[in-house]
């Protein structure tokens, strides 16, 4: 059947998800397309312990989430709801800056390298996580 | 032995439709995206479609967008590629490829003609 | 759409020479680059990916080297083998695009 019962290999298996860490950069939106190449997304953070999680795996280096406001409200890749969900942004973040001279403000989200969250320019070629969840149907204990 | 056998190539004429098939053995197929890539006579290299392992995300070149629908048979480790209203500029050899995590292309198939004649 | 320049579109060599061939990409792709080889009537062999990771089975006479827009496939001493066409490949960004190839032919 197409039920995900374990994690692809070089995927890392956490509380029912699995995670693919890259080691290179892409621009968010191509981030996100190789995360939907492999039938993930990016990485959507619903708690402190998934958060502390991914810090650990990603050490101090700025790393794409799937949180954006590229349409206006920040939106997680998954349909989770941001208003009520988990947080962890920087002091004064998000702040939309435009002083970097690229064009435009700051769209979409990243772990920076203490693992607080930061908007920045959605070109910028940062690496990124990409999350997929295991079937809830394999999570069912085997009949005996 | 890692393997990609193309099929369901010929002539066929402008506007027709031709459905391409590619036979995956040697690996665990549904576990890779896979993709489409084409090369008019005496040309260069044009890349056409890629669709995930699972089958559920697929991207297009424009050139081929809303003509051609790339998708998969997990169960029977083929890949397809239907190709609509056909035209001349169409005339190539399709290879089909395997995709790697570095999102290049490790292994290909040994390709199949679609000419686009009247 | 990001563009792959390719440098020259052929060259000519004898065996033991040492062939490079150059390929810009229009934008910045960091190392999301690829080598391909041709023969006539056959299928493309991939020989380099993210711009220097050589592939398993490739002799180590082929290397590949570069990143942001510039990059570069060196042959250090053609064989008889070589005598191809060569293609790059950006997989940075949909599309991904191939250089037009560069023929390596016989001196």
């Known amino acids: 059947g197409s039920e995900r019962t374990c994690c692809p290999v070089n995927w890392v298996e956490h509380e029912r998800s699995c995670y693919w860490f890259s080691r290179s950069g892409k621009a968010w939106a191509d981030a996100d397309n190789y995360c939907r190449l492999e039938d993930a997304h990016l990485v959507v953070v619903t708690s402190w312990e998934e958060q502390k999680f991914v810090q650990h795996h990603i050490g101090p280096v700025n790393t794409w989430m799937g949180l954006h406001d590229q349409n206006g409200p920040w939106k997680w890749v998954d349909g989770t709801d941001y208003e009520t969900g988990f947080k962890n942004w920087r002091p004064e973040q998000p702040d939309d800056w435009y002083g970097h001279g690229l064009g435009g403000g700051e769209d979409c989200a990243h772990f920076t390298d203490d693992g607080r969250w930061n908007d920045d320019v959605c070109q910028r070629p940062y690496r990124w996580v990409c999350e997929t969840e295991l079937d809830k149907a394999s999570q069912e204990p085997p009949l005996l | 032995e890692v393997q990609l056998l193309e099929s369901g190539g010929g002539l066929v004429q402008p506007g027709g439709s031709l459905r391409l098939s590619c036979a995956a053995s040697g690996f665990t197929f549904s576990s890779y995206a896979m993709s489409w890539v084409r090369q008019a006579p005496g040309k260069g290299l044009e890349w056409v479609s890629v669709?995930?392992?699972?089958?559920?995300?697929?991207f297009y070149a424009d050139s081929v967008k809303g003509r051609f629908t790339i998708s998969r048979d997990n169960s029977k480790n083929t890949l397809y590629l239907q190709m609509n209203s056909l035209r001349a500029e169409d005339t190539a050899v399709y290879y089909c490829?395997?995709?790697?995590?570095?999102?290049?292309?490790?292994?290909w198939g040994q390709g199949t003609m679609v000419t686009v004649s009247s | 759409d990001i563009q792959m320049t390719q440098s020259p579109s052929s060259v000519y060599a004898s065996v033991g020479d040492r062939v490079t061939i150059t390929c810009r990409a229009s934008?910045?792709?960091?190392?999301?680059l690829a080598w391909y080889q041709q023969k006539p009537g056959k299928a493309p062999k991939l020989l380099i990916y993210?711009?220097?990771s050589l592939q398993s089975g490739v002799p180590s006479r082929f290397s590949g080297s570069g990143s942001g827009t510039d990059f570069i496939l060196t042959i250090t001493s053609v064989q008889p083998d070589d005598f191809a066409t060569y293609y790059c490949q950006q997989v940075n960004s949909f599309p991904f695009t191939f250089g037009h190839g560069t023929k390596v032919d016989i001196k």
């Open positions: 993210a711009a220097s």
């Open positions: 490829a395997k995709r790697t995590g570095d999102d290049v292309f490790d292994i």
């Open positions: 669709i995930s392992g699972r089958g559920g995300t697929t």
């Open positions: 934008q910045d792709i960091t190392s999301w």
